[in-house]
Amino acid sequence: KAMHVAQPAVVLANSRGTASFVCEYASPGKATEVRVTVLRQADSQVTEVCAATYMMGNELTFLDDSICTGTSSGNQVNLTIQGLRAMDTGLYICKVELMYPPPYYMGIGNGTQIYVIDPEPCPDSD
């Protein structure tokens, strides 16, 4: 009961520290409730960046203080992570869980390496 999850290998954040990527999953059943989680992995340490549960056909809802936003279309989730700094460069993994109806499925993407470059400060103009 493995579920395949696909995501891009590499993404470059823009100058405002925002990175977007698509997480696509091959659903083995007709899920009506899906949970999507973005995890950051450094070596064997995994931390949760953000998570959202949504009903198929509805919008993703992240917590108000989340750095993530997203939209869904079928088995695709478009994820955006904001407020990234150079120190946040790393491997971001998309995890998809089919929460309802049973049985429960979980799939893990191979991860998207997000590169973040802090913008150079503007020189003072006299």
Partner: nanobody, 120 residues
Framework: EVQLVESGGGLVQPGGSLRLSCAVS????????FTWGRQAPGKGLEWIAT????????NYVDSVKGRFTISRDNANESLYLQMNSLKPEDTALYYC?????????????RGQGTLVTVSS
């Protein structure tokens, strides 16, 4: 928001007992398999036990069979692990996790863990 919160860990002498609890919120507890696992100091994650939604099917790793018992209370959305005849090698951080054994990994939806130390 899905949350799993473990409790009940502590320091216990060899041969002693502990009962771990896991309070689950943010999901329909009664329709999912749940799992207990652990990570000993300097070691990888180890699956311990899984229970199905109705609580009538359980599976255990050989090293804890006959000593540990997994149970659940669907009404109170809680999972338990009764640990008897504890050994020093049971010292670990214990986690409860959503889903069956095959999904227990560093990526599993799980709690922060509760520390069990078995020492005289």
């Amino acid at each position: 928001e899905v949350q799993l919160v473990e409790s009940g860990g502590g320091l216990v002498q060899p041969g002693g007992s502990l009962r771990l609890s896991c309070a689950v919120s943010g999901l329909n507890f009664g329709i999912y398999d749940f799992t207990w696992g652990r990570q000993a100091p300097g070691k990888g994650l180890e699956w311990i036990a899984t229970m199905n939604p109705d609580g009538d099917i359980t599976n255990y790793v050989d090293s804890v069979k006959g000593r540990f018992t997994i149970s659940r209370d669907n009404a109170n959305e809680s999972l338990y692990l009764q640990m008897n005849s504890l050994k020093p090698e049971d010292t670990a951080l214990y986690y409860c996790a959503l889903g069956p054994e095959r999904y227990f990994s560093i990526y599993a939806t799980r709690g922060q863990g509760t520390l069990v130390t078995v020492s005289s």
